[in-house]
């Protein structure tokens, strides 16, 4: 009679390496009397002798996984017990490996110029595997713009035109390589004006072409405005190479003018547009063009450029050197110091610094600025800016100037003229519910009974916009 | 600090006139209009007229046209409301008020006119 | 003229309650109105202006809304000082005109 003999595990399990949908096997040898019961666990839970993946067999002394899968990754021990003394157990790893395989290639993408791209390359493997990409038939080289991200995503900042093109990603390993489909990058480019019309000072009655270059991708198309409308006389011939479009618009010129060159593409939903304008005067008319001290043109600055109307001709200062650059550098100033302001205050100083430094101007024989109604100039600074004025004034008073409208152009409102004395003379200003709660405008009210200086309310003359998200009239 | 200060009550007969003086101090006198307002005993507030201290010009309400005269003097910087033809039911308190809807709310002290035989 | 009309002519309220007086202009006057409160014997006081604006120093329970014909001049949560007589002003053209004005009361 053998006498009994607890269990021995000899072959004690090994690490296994297995390829996803190879079969997979761990051995574990027991000697033991009377033959001992052998379990098998993953991960510490019990292996149902019934689970179809697996096949025990040699008195389970084998556990064989039929077909790996990438979830079998884990921790495997075989138990022996059969009475005699304890249970005795080995443990061994199966590491799943696996080619590479790319879960979520990249798509085509279209990219504004100057923005950042992202093109996705998200892989699995095992040894993780390392991406790379390919544009055309060459590698791609990381540089301060480009880069692989650690998810493998290429992540392009500033993109610029010479980023178009075909680009896949590449995921490999020690197992295999796989690569991506072909995907196309288009970079899109702003409308932007490479020569701009010329101004032309002429004699009554002659011909004038203005050229107007342009470039975007897509190519952009080109529109011509005169003094703020669409032109109503004259010829157009476009020609279009490389990208590039070039306009030409021929006029006979009667009377002096603001002709402005729009250039324009769409990208998706949204437009983007490129400006440029010319004037064409009329020789004999400078003399008094002169005396006005100043011109019209479009206003082609940016800070004021929510709060004027669209296209509106504006007056510029000739008693400054460059007059177009000095008024905004006052209107850029006068905006640094509104930061400084209230929320109820801010609209209505902006409306009133910009309408009173690019005054709405009337383009005649002598171009003519329209001041501020003085009405409005005085809500503004007793009204919507009370606490401010107040400060300011009693800061200048001491001579200490350190209000947040200290710096401000602003304009003496009793030296405006009325509103209630003539609706041409002066130029009304949007007001905005201060609570933002509705868009606020004003109307026409037609005058009844004249009085000297102040006979009823006039019809309003002028438009503006006073942001993206107030319009009033 | 801005102040507009009227001159003292007043009693006067049916048919006479009156004219009344608001006296402005603490700011540019001639940088901002002037209105008249007046109310009667146990009444509302009633517009009157407009006027422009730097010209001179006037705008007053049709019920008022022809029987009041707004003026002003720069060197004292005084407004003056005078009324003509008075009625009994022209007893009110007149007010001068700077502004009233443009700019900032300054209000004369009253002056009560007593119109009776 | 614009004739300009409050309502109601009198009204009475506790204190806390929100009280609401209204003001319609005979034609579109815009925003250009302006709400005044007068106490007996006291020269008239503007709450608002432009329709809504907040006079400095008024408190914050005071609120004007409205543009075109209907305004509205909300009190918020009545106190005891706010008990008096409240008037609306067009200044969208000449005359100028008020309401009739609303004599608010002690419930």
């Known amino acids: 009679e053998k006498l009994p003999k607890a269990p021995v595990i000899t072959t004690p399990l090994e690490t296994v390496d297995a390829l996803v949908e190879e079969v997979a096997t761990f051995m574990c040898a027991v000697e033991s009397y009377p033959q001992p019961e052998i379990s098998w666990t993953r991960n510490k839970i019990l292996i149902k002798l019934f689970d179809t993946r697996y096949s025990i067999r040699e008195n389970g002394q084998l556990l064989t996984i039929l077909s790996v899968e990438d979830s079998d990754d884990g921790i495997y021990c075989c138990i022996a017990n059969n009475g005699v003394g304890g249970a005795v157990e080995s443990c061994g790893a199966l590491q799943v490996k696996m080619k590479p395989k790319i879960t979520r290639p990249p798509i085509n993408v279209k990219i504004i110029e100057g923005l950042k791209a992202v093109l996705p390359c998200t892989t699995m493997g095992n040894p993780k595997p390392s991406v790379s990409w390919i544009k055309g038939d060459n590698a791609l080289r990381e540089n301060s713009r480009i880069a692989v991200l650690e998810s493998g995503s290429l992540r392009i900042h500033n993109v610029q035109k010479e980023d178009a093109g075909q680009y896949r990603c590449v995921a490999k390993n020690s197992l295999g390589t796989a690569y991506s489909k072909l995907v196309k990058l288009e970079v899109e480019v702003f409308a932007r004006i490479l020569r701009a019309p010329e101004s032309h000072n002429v004699t009554f009655g002659s011909f004038v072409t203005l050229r107007c270059t342009a470039i975007g991708i897509p190519v952009p198309t080109i529109s011509w405005i005169e003094n703020g409308n669409a032109v109503s006389s004259g010829s157009i011939q476009e020609s279009v190479k490389d990208r590039v479009i070039d306009s030409r618009l021929q006029l006979f010129i009667t009377k002096p003018g603001l002709y402005t060159c729009i250039a324009t593409n769409k990208h998706g939903e949204k437009f983007s547009t490129a400006k440029a304008a010319a004037t064409v005067s009329i020789a004999e008319w400078s003399k008094s063009q002169k005396d006005s001290q100043g011109y019209c043109a479009q206003y082609r600055g940016e800070v004021c450029d929510a709060v004027l109307a669209k296209d509106a001709l504006v007056f510029f200062n000739t008693s400054y050197r460059d007059p177009e650059d000095a008024q905004e550098l006052l209107i850029h100033t006068a905006w640094n110091e509104l930061k400084a302001v209230s929320p109820l205050c801010r609209p209505a100083a902006e409306a009133l610094l910009c309408n009173h430094l690019f005054q709405e101007c009337s383009p005649g024989v002598v171009p003519t600025p329209m001041p501020i109604c003085r009405e409005y100039c005085l809500a503004v600074k007793e009204l919507f800016c009370a606490k401010e004025w107040q400060a300011m004034e009693g800061k200048a008073h001491r001579g200490l100037y350190r209000s947040g409208m200290h710096l401000l152009p602003v304009p003496e409102c009793s030296k405006l003229p009325s509103m209630h004395r003539d609706p041409t003379a002066c130029t009304r200003l949007p007001y905005l519910d201060y609570k933002k709660e509705n868009i606020t405008t004003f109307p026409s009210i037609t005058s009844s009974r004249p009085s000297a200086d102040i006979p009823n309310l006039p019809a309003s003359t002028s438009s503006f916009a006073v942001s993206p998200a107030y319009s009033m009239t | 600090q801005v102040q507009l200060v009227q001159s003292g009550a007043e009693e006067k007969k049916p048919g006479a006139s009156v004219k009344v003086s608001c006296k402005a101090s603490?700011?540019?006198?001639?940088?901002?209009?002037m209105h008249w307002v007046r109310q009667a005993p146990g009444q509302g507030l009633e517009w009157m007229g407009i006027?422009?201290?730097?010209?001179?010009?006037?705008s007053y309400a049709q019920k008022f046209q022809g029987r009041v005269t707004m003026t002003r003097d720069t060197s004292t910087s005084t407004v003056y409301m005078e009324l003509s033809s008075l009625r009994s039911e022209d007893t009110a308190v007149y007010y001068c008020a700077r502004e009233l809807g443009w700019g900032s709310d300054y209000w004369g002290q009253g002056t009560l006119v007593t119109v009776s035989s | 003229d614009i004739q300009m009309t409050q309502s109601p002519s009198a009204m009475s309220a506790s204190i806390g309650d929100r009280v609401t007086i209204t003001c319609r202009a005979s034609?579109?006057?815009?925003?250009?109105l302006a709400w005044f409160q007068q106490k007996p014997g006291k020269v008239p006081k503007r709450l608002i202006y432009v329709a809504s604006g907040l006079q400095s120093g008024v408190p914050s329970r005071f609120s004007g809304s409205g543009s075109g014909t209907e305004f509205t001049l909300t009190i918020s949560s009545l106190q005891p000082e706010d008990f008096a007589t409240y008037y609306c002003l067009q200044h969208n053209s000449y005359p100028f005109t008020f309401g009739q004005g609303t004599k608010l009361e002690i419930k």
């Open positions: 603490g700011y540019t006198f001639t940088n901002y209009y």
């Open positions: 006027i422009n201290p730097s010209g001179g010009n006037t």
């Open positions: 034609q579109d006057i815009s925003n250009y």
